[in-house]
Interface confidence: medium
């Protein structure tokens, strides 16, 4: 989750990640070009609520200050760990040209060529080592290894990095061997659910644009609000059908049949007081989808959820009621009422897929995660467009840890707050070709909402 160039003994000891941009060693953060400056990391100091009651026990508190307290602060539309890139939605050498908004479309409406580009890009991301970032394999206190001289890091592929980010946001706090503190989640069960997953997808989309050399590459979405008992993207033409001889595995006719998963052995990491190190841990699995005749959410569920005008409500947790966020996440019923026995929308779609996709720490291993969350984000975006909320709609304090408005989303780096992603998709350089009105449009006639 940190730039490779910063994970040196000096960088870790000095807690400073302000790399130079280009060959000029003094051009830290693109400073000589006016792109940014090395600055003190700002973190949210307001109180949080919820079940995490410890203090200074977790690497992710005050993120990312346990690791780096000085990072590049980019000016204008510049972005990136060395201010060498542009903010989402901007392009050009000076990042002052608005990029034409890319269009995220229903996966079923892609042409054969577009479908191949998407699936090929995912496969390429699974096989390509990330050029700039590494993952940490030990906790903050053990980050320099047993001798205190060797940063404990590992290379991993672009897609596995995407998986690791999700794992790290939900992993337990480790208090010692086999002593996990589980009451913590930086990307679910609170308002940050929508912004965290939005940034997560934007990150992957940008990586896939870079890998494919196509700046207008867009992630498709899976409209899971069909009310059916089948996964219509689980086919060999799309994200892989079930294997005949072992339906928990993916058909050999799909490129995803060979995908191995990372970050699945949570109990093992807890026992060894370590972090997921990107080692492959077996094949991707989807147990029988829609077990017990479970059905996917319906379009009516989506519409009910969109009719909730309050973004979130106290205690900003999984028991919030009449909260758009909690209904979308799926802890509330779609109409905003609470029924702890019921899963809905996003949660129901994950549960329906069973297998790897049903466990938060490993869910992102399954490429269905990408298109599932793309649709979840489309619902969030529709709500934003309908309600045009001010930032005050987001709690400044007393949300669970990681979920206050100004908290830096864990473990994204350089730091980015929830507030920075509480914008319409268009402001971030993309749009959805989706119609979430009463009549469900056939996939061949999608319209821009």
């Amino acid at each position: 989750q940190f730039p490779r160039v910063c994970m040196t003994l000096d960088g870790v000891l000095n807690k400073e990640c302000c790399p130079p941009l280009g060959p000029e060693a003094t051009n830290i953060c693109g400073f000589l070009e006016g792109r940014g400056q090395c600055a003190e990391v700002q973190t949210d100091t307001r109180p949080w609520s919820g079940p995490y009651i410890l203090r200074n026990q977790d690497d992710r508190e005050q993120w990312p200050r346990k690791f780096f307290n000085r990072t590049c602060k980019c000016t204008g539309n510049f972005a990136g760990y060395n201010c060498g890139g542009c903010k989402f939605g901007w392009t050009g050498p000076d990042c002052n040209r608005k990029k034409p908004a890319i269009l995220r479309r229903n996966i079923h409406s892609l042409t054969a060529q577009e479908r191949e580009q998407f699936l090929g890009a995912l496969d390429l991301a699974k096989k390509s080592i990330h050029p700039d970032y590494v993952i940490t394999t030990q906790h903050w206190l053990g980050l320099l290894g047993p001798n205190g001289t060797q940063p404990q890091i590992a290379n991993c592929s672009v897609y596995d990095f995407f998986v690791w980010l999700h794992y790290y946001s939900v992993r337990d706090t480790l208090l010692g061997p086999g002593r996990p503190y589980k009451a913590i989640d930086f990307s679910h069960q609170g308002p940050a659910f929508v912004t965290w997953h939005r940034y997560h997808l934007l990150w992957l989309e940008r990586e896939l644009q870079r890998l494919t050399g196509n700046e207008s590459f867009a992630l498709p979405y899976w409209n899971f609000a069909t009310g059916k008992n089948e996964c219509d993207v689980c086919t060999d033409e799309l994200l892989g059908a079930a294997r005949q001889d072992d339906p928990t595995l993916i058909s050999r006719n799909s490129r995803f049949s060979t995908w191995e998963i990372v970050c699945d052995s949570l109990d093992d990491y807890n026992r060894r007081v370590t972090l997921c190190n990107g080692t492959y841990e077996g094949l991707l699995r989807r147990n029988k989808v829609g077990r017990n005749n479970e059905k996917l959410p319906t379009l009516k569920n989506v519409q009910d959820c969109l009719s909730l005008q309050k973004f979130d409500s106290p205690p900003f947790f999984q028991n919030s009621t009449f909260s758009f966020r909690n209904a979308l996440e799926g802890f509330d019923k779609a109409d905003g009422t609470l029924d702890s026995q019921v899963m809905n929308l996003h949660n129901l779609a994950h549960s329906f897929l069973n297998g790897t996709n049903a466990l938060p720490h490993s869910a992102a291993n399954d490429p269905v995660f990408v298109v599932l969350h793309s649709f979840t984000d489309a619902i969030f975006d529709e709500w934003l467009k309908r309600n045009n909320p001010s930032t005050d709609a987001w709690p400044q304090e007393l949300a669970p840890i990681g979920h206050n408005r100004m908290y830096n989303m864990v473990p994204f780096f350089p730091p980015v707050t929830n507030e920075e992603l509480f914008l319409t998709a268009e402001q971030l350089g993309y749009n959805y070709a989706v119609d979430l009105s009463e009549e469900e449009a056939p996939v061949w006639s999608t319209t821009l909402s």
């Epitope: 000095n14 400073e16 302000c18 060693a25 003094t26 830290i28 693109g30 400073f31 000589l32 070009e33 006016g34 792109r35 400056q37 090395c38 600055a39 003190e40 000085r70 000016t75 204008g76």
Partner: antibody, heavy 122, light 107 residues
């Protein structure tokens, strides 16, 4: 109390060299970037050089690049400015100043010394 | 290089008055601007950085505002110790440059 005391200013001939020093006290010198700023006889202020807290990074305007070298000795809490190939337009009061935020480099200077005078004339 | 243009070059005011000094950057410097005060025979002192953040120990009658290319320093209820010269300086990308200064004199 933060104190910066410059020394080494003198009258020097064009083409000559001079080394200025700045002794720092009252703060953790190694945590701060430092700069030299000069004030010309017509009272204009001109930034001359900056060095990062650890000494790894140095910055100069084009007007002095290649002629002036900023350096520091964190063990001695001292900042230096080595000036060579001096020109008449380098005549000024030279101030050493502390960068106001404890980052690698930040351009607002929160403490200044009393200055040392450099005159370049034949 | 970014040019900083200060106005007025000089200004006379009385104790208790409110004065405003402006500074214009030749290009967008966002909020990377500092203001300094210099009294006769003394070295400059930082008043404001990041366009509006008061430096430690600076009285609240001083306030900075602006972003992009237009900035101002306002001094409410002038005190005798406020007379002297004022300089703006951008701290965006190097080279950092200063304005030509504004001399504030007692009327």
């Amino acid at each position: 109390e933060v104190q910066l005391v410059e020394s080494g200013g003198d009258l020097v001939k064009p083409g000559g060299s001079l080394k200025l020093s700045c002794a720092a006290s009252g703060f953790t010198f190694s945590s701060y970037g430092m700069s030299w700023v000069r004030q010309t006889p017509d009272k204009r202020l001109e930034w001359v050089a900056t060095i990062s807290s650890g000494g790894s990074y140095t910055y100069y305007p084009d007007s002095v690049k290649g002629r002036f070298t900023i350096s520091r000795d964190n063990a001695k809490n001292t900042l230096y400015l080595q000036m060579s190939s001096l020109k008449s337009e380098d005549t000024a009061m030279y101030y050493c100043a502390r960068l106001g935020v404890t980052t690698v480099v930040h351009g607002a200077m929160d403490y200044w010394g009393q200055g040392t005078s450099v005159t370049v004339s034949s | 290089d970014i040019q900083m243009t200060q106005s007025p070059a000089s200004l006379s005011a009385s104790v208790g008055e409110t004065v405003t000094i402006t500074c214009r950057a030749s290009e967008n410097i966002y909020s990377y601007l500092a203001w300094y005060q210099q009294k006769q025979g003394k070295s400059p002192q930082l008043l404001v950085y990041n366009a509006k953040t008061l430096a430690e120990g600076v009285p609240s009658r001083f306030s900075g505002s602006g972003s992009g290319t237009q900035f101002s320093l306002k001094i409410n209820s002038l005190q005798p110790e406020d007379f002297g010269s004022y300089y703006c300086q951008h701290h965006y990308g190097t080279p950092w440059t200063f304005g030509g200064g504004t001399k504030l004199e007692i009327k």
